[in-house]
Amino acid sequence: IWELKKDVYVVELDWYPDAPGEMVVLTCDTPEEDGITWTLDQSSEVLGSGKTLTIQVKEFGDAGQYTCHKGGEVLSHSLLLLHKKEDGIWSTDILKDQKEPKNKTFLRCEAKNYSGRFTCWWLTTISTDLTFSVKSSRGSSDPQGVTCGAATLSAERVRGDNKEYEYSVECQEDSACPAAEESLPIEVMVDAVHKLKYENYTSSFFIRDIIKPDPPKNLQLKPLKNSRQVEVSWEYPDTWSTPHSYFSLTFCVQVQGKSKREKKDRVFTDKTSATVICRKNASISVRAQDRYYSSSWSEWASVPCS
Amino acid sequence: RAVPGGSSPAWTQCQQLSQKLCTLAWSAHPLVGHMDLREEGDEETTNDVPHIQCGDGCDPQGLRDNSQFCLQRIHQGLIFYEKLLGSDIFTGEPSLLPDSPVGQLHASLLGLSQLLQPEGHHWETQQIPSLSPSQPWQRLLLRFKILRSLQAFVAVAARVFAHGAATLSP
């Protein structure tokens, strides 16, 4: 058993049929010694008396808010949550496995640049009695500070018969060093509580591996005289790290016909312009990637050919 | 050439070679063998490798003030990785394919380090760590981890040389 926060405790249980459970001793936070009784949740049934209460925690029915009273007055509360371990593996019932980039990916994170700011998100089908708390650090043995905001509900989607809820959080490394080569990963830890179930999820990454630039901006076409060719030009996204001579991007320019089946013409360039043939009803798209480190490509920025 | 005394390196040559190194490091990575282990090998093998850290002067401001600190750190890393790529980790079982980009990568690391340090000048280099793989699967794991770490290192080096070529070239 360990304390999650003041008066909230997590009991770790091996979860299998007829498991013995854990013996837990609760102590009433009071100078009083006599006449103390204990109840669970809204029930008025007295579970025991005395300053301490010993219980065998085996199932969710044994978890909840234990309250000690004296003469009708509440002295203190202890909320017990359960953390299930099945066959040596902690349960992951609350969050959905996003399966990208690999199985057992519950938290996904992205950064738009090297400033030390990043966003993480996760999915659940649970709509009520759900709380999240997020902590983060750079490294784990001698952790350096990362400040995270509160997790918020950022999207709701219908998936078949189910509703899916997306939560996200923004974090910022306290003393980021954009130009350095990271040697210690960022650690993100999410505590999830649904009713009386506790679970924790972690992700470990380098900012360089979660970089996804915003799409190029100001995408423009300039027809070339007496030719089907056009000059496409664009600019670095505002959110990308500066100076651009140091934090350089590379670009992919694509000409795509109306039909998805049509052959795509692609050009790769380090410049912020390219010359391509503009076909009728086609569109021109450009996306960006870090020039020196193969993290994610940005989404496409697009303009019609006409 | 980056003479330890303080003259400028051939920024444009260094830029071209460091960008080639980036490409080679990424093309070598998937080719050192099928690898599920990399998904689970969570402990850092690379704590002993020379990283380009915050105080090494490799940021744009630091390069403007005095690029020598940064160039020395890059040189140190290049020599270090060159030694690792020539060690038993890459030469032992399982054998790399004859056309593996690791050979080219090894040669290019040496090439860039020589551009930075002409004959007769010596910056101190870091000892190669004893990673002591005794099994082929351990070598394979280390190859992945070393190449991942090298990708990060050469990315910073390439940024340095690109910025130098754009802003510090005579």
Epitope: - | L37, G41, E43, P94, Q135, Q138, L141
Partner: antibody, heavy 121, light 111 residues
Framework: EVTLKESGPVLVKPTETLTLTCTVS????????ISWIRQPPGKALEWLGV???????NYNSGIKSRLTISKDTSKSQVVLTMTNMDPVDTATYYC???????????????WGQGTTVTVSS | DIVLTQSPDSLAVSLGERATINCRAS??????????MHWFQQKPGQPPKLLIY???NLESGIPDRFSGSGSRTDFTLTISSLQAEDVAVYYC?????????FGGGTKVEIK
């Protein structure tokens, strides 16, 4: 289908040399390592040695001086030679494939049926 | 050499009940976060069969009532609901250092 089959004498006299051959099919010896493992009657398993994809070998130091493992990749055969046999070497000898280096980390994914060798005069 | 000690030596469990076998190594069998510990099942007159590799990965074709956990020196094989066909001897094996070594085996029977 992956198969490994051990062949060789079932009876060997003390001080003689044992030669066992492992013939494999369904995979190439240039892609997978082969280990030899033995199991005395009613006892646990003992690893004897391995021949790697590139032809290098490692042996159990306890019996290293008596062991040689070699292979002929084109014939898909691995040969175990063990000199100076003794009654305590009576065991079932297995030829075993070590799983893909990058996934299995030294786990042995396919085993031959084993050949029982008795050392007796 | 790395010594692997299995416990218990034998285990009698009722059908449908849980069976747990432990394997303790004399030194860590982890290499940079990878546990080179594997579990095998051997039935009489048959060669051993790989069940679990790298401590917790289920070999293809093995029922998911088998699971493995642990790291460094302490490892566990669990059969969540014992079936009649699970009666066998179970061995752990490490491949972190030469020589590869096996545990002494745990015999699982039906109560």
């Amino acid at each position: 289908e992956v198969t490994l089959k051990e062949s060789g004498p079932v009876l060997v006299k003390p001080t003689e040399t044992l030669t066992l051959t492992c013939t494999v099919s369904g995979f190439s010896l240039s892609s997978y390592a082969i280990s030899w493992i033995r199991q005395p009657p009613g006892k646990a398993l003992e690893w004897l040695g391995v021949i790697w994809t590139g032809g290098g070998t490692n042996y159990n130091s306890g019996i290293k001086s008596r062991l040689t493992i070699s292979k002929d990749t084109s014939k898909s055969q691995v040969v175990l030679t063990m000199t100076n046999m003794d009654p305590v070497d009576t065991a079932t000898y297995y030829c075993v494939r070590e799983g893909d280096y990058g996934s299995y980390a030294g786990a042995m994914d396919y085993w031959g049926q084993g050949t029982t060798v008795t050392v007796s005069s | 050499d790395i010594v692997l000690t299995q416990s218990p030596d034998s285990l009698a469990v009722s059908l449908g009940e849980r069976a747990t076998i432990n394997c303790r190594a004399s030194e860590s069998v982890d290499y940079y976060g990878i546990s080179s510990m594997h579990w095998f099942q051997q039935k009489p007159g048959q060669p051993p069969k790989l069940l679990i590799y790298r401590a917790s990965n289920l070999e293809s074709g093995i029922p998911d009532r088998f699971s493995g956990s642990g790291s460094r020196t302490d490892f566990t094989l669990t059969i969540s609901s014992l079936q009649a066909e699970d009666v066998a001897v179970y061995y752990c094996q490490q491949a972190n250092k030469d020589p590869y070594t096996f545990g002494g085996g745990t015999k699982v029977e039906i109560k």
